[in-house]
């Protein structure tokens, strides 16, 4: 078939409107001016173009902006965003939170695609840190976003942003990530009173050290078993039976059901059986009476 390059008479687009959906691909290429398209990008999303047609429009914008689109165009990409590659997006400089929201809205309901991940990365790097408004926006669209970041990336989250984090945002975080987030949360919530503080800090406790758990045990917090099971094993091991009892309050009875799972299993092995018996839960596996416990790690440190 002969390549059609000239725009047919009377078909030159004067504006971006619905009539263009009936243009064939070659007609769009020939009859739509790229500069006109760029200035009227806000109209594109309201017109039901096929993705085939959107490919043509994207090609026109790529030719007009080989170094990357300006933010005035990016903000109005709409469904055209779903035709962008991560390589395209790496050329962009997105600084406005409104632009970010507009593009995330297009992808709403879908998994985080490589394009979206690249967009977020460009945006956060441009801002220098993950501020509260950005974090609010990202976790609203992708609850698991925070846990997709490396510990190094999380280190750029300012403590003030922690207020935006909801418990479900931390569901998939691993201990290394919580190790980074916990001190920030502790700092963010430090001026709250006991019970309010515990409600806020609870979902971050997977990063808490032993001394903080000991302090919490003195505050009648009644930690639930689900939270206890997410604590760092190395932080739980030094706790005494009395401290765990105080920490869990009425939930201490739940230890029996978890006695074969970490960190409960490992903690039981470190306790005197006599002490475990005081709980009246039938926990077994503690150190028998009369046995001496040598802490070899202490011995090595001394020698």
């Amino acid at each position: 078939e002969v390549e059609k390059t000239a725009c047919p008479s009377g078909k030159k687009a004067r504006e971006i409107d619905e009539s263009l959906i009936f243009y064939k691909k070659w007609e769009l290429e020939a009859c739509v001016d790229a500069a006109l398209l760029a200035t009227q990008m806000d109209r594109v999303n309201a017109i039901p173009f096929t993705y085939e047609q959107l490919d043509v429009l994207k090609h026109k914008l790529d030719e007009l902006y080989p170094q990357g689109y300006p933010e005035s165009v990016i903000q109005h990409l709409g469904y055209l965003f779903l035709k962008m590659s991560p390589e395209d997006i790496r050329k962009w400089n997105v600084t406005s939170l409104e632009t970010l929201k507009a593009l995330l809205e297009v992808n709403k309901g879908h998994e985080m695609s490589p394009q979206v991940a690249t967009l977020i990365d460009r945006f956060v790097k441009g801002r220098g840190q993950l501020d509260k408004d950005t974090l609010d926006t990202l976790t609203a669209f992708y609850p698991g976003y925070l846990c997709s970041l490396s510990p190094e990336e999380l280190s750029s989250v300012p403590p003030s942003s922690i207020w935006a984090v909801r418990p479900q945002d931390l569901d998939t975080c691993d201990p290394r990530q919580l190790d980074v987030l916990y001190p920030k949360a502790r700092l963010a919530f430090q001026n709250m009173n006991g019970s309010e503080y515990f409600v806020k800090i609870q979902s971050f406790l997977g990063g808490a050290p032993t001394e903080d758990l000991k302090a919490l045990s003195q505050q009648n917090v009644s930690m639930d078993l689900a939270t206890f099971m997410k604590l760092r094993t190395d932080a739980v091991l030094p706790l005494t039976v009395a401290e765990v009892q105080k920490l869990l309050g009425p939930h201490v009875e739940g230890l029996k059901a978890e006695e074969r799972h970490r960190p409960v299993r490992d903690w039981i092995l470190r306790q005197r059986q006599d002490d475990l018996d005081t709980l009246g839960l039938g926990l077994q596996g503690g150190i028998p009476n009369g046995y001496l416990v040598l802490d070899l790690s202490m011995q090595e440190a001394l020698s």
């Epitope: 039901p48 993705y51 085939e52 998994e111």
Partner: nanobody, 119 residues
């Protein structure tokens, strides 16, 4: 997204046909859908579109004679064609916008087409 057209056939000039396009797969309601046709030896052309919001658009040549609609409960797109003309003999294809979940790209899904012959 899989699309299967039906309802084509042989009809006399001035007659009517109703084409159906059954969609299976993800998010039927979320995207624009439409009908294209391709006559023998001609380029494919868009006939009618219904947007995700329910707005309808028609090629000038079919306005007032063709009606596009969709039934969300049946995941089906329709094209009611009245006062058919011999020059509208073509294979009619339905399409739906979709989303490639593996690649993260928007794309068009097409049916295999249903043949309409107007004598």
């Amino acid at each position: 997204v899989q699309l299967v057209e039906s309802g084509g056939g042989l009809v006399q000039a001035g007659g009517s046909l109703r084409l159906s396009c059954a969609a299976s797969g993800r998010t039927f309601s979320s995207y624009n859908m439409g009908w294209h046709r391709q006559a023998p030896g001609k380029e494919r052309e868009l006939v009618a579109v219904i947007s995700s919001g329910g707005s309808t658009y028609y090629a000038d040549s079919v306005k007032g004679r063709f009606t596009i609609s969709r039934d969300y409960s049946k995941n089906t797109l329709y094209l009611q064609m009245n006062s058919l003309k011999p020059e509208e003999t073509a294979v009619y294809y339905c399409y739906a916008q979709g989303y490639d979940y593996d690649e993260g790209y928007g794309m068009d899904y097409w049916g295999q087409g249903t043949s309409v012959t107007v004598s």
